[in-house]
């Protein structure tokens, strides 16, 4: 808290300009009018104010707008945004995507701060859903943004927004998140032809069910091993050797290097060794010839 002192003669700020960087904290408090500051916020970012000086300017704005800043001020906060607390931001009503972009720009190149997370949360809740333009903006600044949302939050993403998602945006998503995103992607890309569809849907396949993988195996997609390794184990297990061979195409040879890792390991254990041998890859661990496989889950369902 800066104590109230009279502004020295001749130092009253007529405008927000670079001369203010030479003002002590108490001089800024005494000589800068809060209303002037609010109307000339766009100039603050052009001046190299220090941490301490910005504290004073923030204090002046807080006094002027105790209920929260208007969007006209928020849009021009610039680096002063970094001084805001999540509590400050919760008082704001940010509706313009331009305002959001301006504030995200300030933190560009740095990891998402609690302030940024709160701002995004306020913005998205205000809009009611994560529309395409917002998602486009957020993933441009924070590629991992989508994967930071809970499955419940992801459910509010409309299928049309999925077009904005790039493969790298899904890198840190877990299976529960992909379970929510995959059906939306399937819907979003449903009118595309085979090869184009696969290019778009590929990064979402960690949420695909068995029947969709079976369908893809009939389309000569040549799925790479990296994608295959991210598939749900429960979706891969029912696939036959022939289906996996068709799904992977020339990449099937990569199974050998992954035979000890899930889902390949678990899939091998479910296949007949005879069938695995047809691949000519030396995969071991399948069901020996002459053994009968009982599906106990099916038996329980019948009893």
């Amino acid at each position: 808290e800066v104590e109230k002192t009279a502004c020295p003669s001749g130092k009253k700020a007529r405008e927000i300009d670079e001369s203010l960087i030479f003002y002590k904290k108490w001089e800024l408090e005494a000589c800068v009018d809060a209303a002037l500051l609010a109307t000339q916020m766009d100039r603050v970012n052009a001046i190299p104010f220090t941490y301490e000086q910005l504290d004073v300017l923030k204090h002046k704005l807080d006094e002027l707008y105790p209920q929260g800043y208007p969007e006209s001020v928020i849009q021009h906060l610039g680096y002063l945004f970094l001084k805001m607390s999540p509590e400050d931001i919760r008082k704001w009503n940010v509706t313009s995507l331009e305002t959001l972009k301006a504030l995200l720009e300030v933190n560009k190149g740095h990891e998402m701060s609690p302030q940024v997370a709160t701002l995004i949360d306020r913005f998205v809740k205000g809009r009611g859903q994560l529309d395409k333009d917002t998602l486009d903006t957020l993933t441009a600044f924070y590629p991992g943004y989508l994967c930071s949302l809970s499955p419940e939050e992801l459910s509010s993403v409309p299928p049309s927004s999925i077009w904005a998602v790039r493969p790298q945006d899904l890198d840190t998503c877990d299976p529960r998140q992909l379970d929510v995103l995959y059906p939306k992607a399937r819907l979003a890309f449903q009118n595309m032809n085979g090869s184009e569809y696969f290019v778009k849907i590929q990064s979402f396949l960690g949420g695909a069910p068995t029947e969709d993988l079976k369908a893809l195996s009939q389309q000569n997609v040549s799925m790479d091993l990296a994608t295959f390794m991210k598939l749900r184990t429960d979706a891969v297990l029912p696939l036959t050797v022939a289906e996996v061979q068709k799904l992977l195409g020339p990449h099937v040879e990569g199974l050998k290097a992954e035979e000890r890792h899930r889902p390949v390991r678990d899939w091998i254990l479910r296949q007949r060794q005879d069938d695995l041998d047809t691949l000519g890859l030396g995969l071991q661990g399948g069901i020996p010839n002459g053994y009968l496989v009982l599906d106990l889950s099916m038996q329980e369902a019948l009893s």
Epitope: A46, P48, F49, T50, Y51, L82, K83
Partner: nanobody
């Protein structure tokens, strides 16, 4: 963000030095920047500044002697110091943008006029 100041040293009164400050990223090309100095036992104070628009301003004590400039391609800011006086003795720092707001500083470069 990393800030590396250099160019300081021991110089006689009336002599000159050119300080450089290099930053990681494109920090200086897009932001307002300033040179600050801190004499022993004193608070850090600004000596020269350049707005993001390119206009410059100087503390009264260095006007006409010091010149701030920047090279956006090299992401470097300079402080040309001429007609140095003993009272210019201090550790000099540069800063701007994100790191200035977050109160992150480099090691500074020491200038001694004697």
């Amino acid at each position: 963000v990393q800030l590396v100041e250099s160019g300081g040293g021991l110089v006689q009164p009336g002599g000159s030095l050119r300080l450089s400050c290099a930053a990681s990223g494109s920090m200086f090309s897009i932001n307002a920047v300033a040179w600050y100095r801190q004499a022993p036992g004193e608070q850090r104070e600004p000596v020269a500044a350049m707005t993001s628009g390119g206009s410059t301003i100087y503390a009264d004590s260095v006007k006409g002697r010091f010149t701030i400039s920047r090279d956006n391609a090299k992401n470097t800011v300079y402080l040309q110091m001429n007609s140095l006086k003993p009272e210019d003795t201090a550790v000099y720092y540069c800063n701007g943008g994100w790191s200035l707001v977050m109160d992150y500083w480099g090691q500074g470069t020491s200038v001694t006029v004697s």
